[in-house]
């Protein structure tokens, strides 16, 4: 090998990567908030809705301080993968009923996928442990009725909103440690 010529900076520094990940998460949080408003407007919810297949909220914002970088990113990635799967399921299962939300749901899915890629890239650049995703869960059963699907949509968007809110806080905290 010859003398080291050096390389031009080809890609963002992990700290810059973290900044852009925070921006993407914030924009996804806003997308989710707007979609939730639209959904409530078109299909008013009667109270809170749950879906057993959704991940439980990773952590209260107050308990974030004790977390380590790898556990935050690993958990966040696992939860977001689950939400991506649920959004895909929702679009397939409820195509006609949720037609009015379709362009936005499609955008949400695309941005969620992009955020997952960013998180993985960040973990690679920092050389943090990358646990394999959980084994594929059994396919989600189609909703029993249109209203069942709408309740599921409320649960998915509500849970995703909470997770992304947690994610923004967590990523901002991690930035101070990097």
């Amino acid at each position: 090998p010859g003398p080291p010529p050096g390389s031009p900076r080809a890609s963002p520094d992990p700290r810059a990567e973290l900044d852009s990940t925070v921006l993407l998460t914030r924009s996804l949080l806003e997308d989710t908030r707007q979609l939730t408003i639209q959904l409530k407007d078109k299909f008013p919810a009667d109270g809170d809705h749950n879906l057993d297949s959704l991940p439980t909220l990773a952590m209260s914002a107050g308990a974030l301080g004790a977390l380590q970088l790898p556990s935050v990113l690993t958990r966040l990635r696992a939860d977001l993968l689950s939400y991506l799967r649920h959004v895909q399921w929702l679009r397939r299962a409820m195509g006609s009923s949720l037609k009015t939300l379709e362009p936005e749901l499609g955008t949400l899915q695309t941005r969620l996928d992009r955020l997952l890629r960013r998180l993985q890239l960040l973990m690679s650049r920092l050389a943090l442990p990358q646990l394999p995703p959980d084994p594929p869960a059994p396919p989600l059963a189609p909703p029993s009725s249109t209203w069942g699907g709408i309740r599921a949509a409320h649960a998915i968007l509500g849970g995703l909103h909470l997770t992304l809110d947690w994610a923004v806080r967590g990523l901002l905290l991690l930035k101070t440690r990097l």
Epitope: A10, D13, R117, S124, A127
Partner: antibody, heavy 114, light 111 residues
Amino acid sequence: EVQLLESGGGLVQPGGSLRLSCAASGFTFSSYGMHWVRQAPGKGLEWVAVISYDGSYKYYADSVKGRFTISRDNSKNTLYLQMNSLRAEDTAVYYCAAGVPDYWGQGTLVTVSS
Amino acid sequence: QSVLTQPPSASGTPGQRVTISCSGSSSNIGSDYDVHWYQQLPGTAPKLLIYSNNERPSGVPDRFSGSKSGTSASLAISGLRSEDEADYYCSAWDSSLSGPVFGGGTKLTVL
């Protein structure tokens, strides 16, 4: 401009030891995970070891586990590879690389031969 | 034996489009881990060509593109040039090894 400069390679007898160093400049060394990757003459790339940005996580290829140790000194912007119990099959150009890896050094040749 | 499988060689004439494949398994590419591609010109160190399946680092021409599906990935080079003659390697994280794995490399010849 990003620079990774490896040193410490050379000729060593089987069973011997060698310590490679990699001096980094032009980027925030302490924000990057760092790798050692090797390439035997005329062969492909083989990942050797990785250390996380803060040194808290270290992983090794099975072929070097228990013989090689990766470490870093963020205050000196330097990565190290301590190689013990060297074998003929460890003969290769050893590259230090940062991130994905995004950046690579030019490599240092390690020859294990009697 | 490399963990990721690539064809040992590929070739094309100037201006042509060439594709190099990279096949993995459920512990690497199939586990939703991203694929990265490297170019190694004769006598030099590898250089990152594509990261995160299809992203190009600054300075890499848009003639180079990547894609991924299931447990495999591919690198496409369009408008082939003589300076593209090099070895190309794919790489992905492998959960069973807790580290990145590389393909065996593909030697691209521009005829």
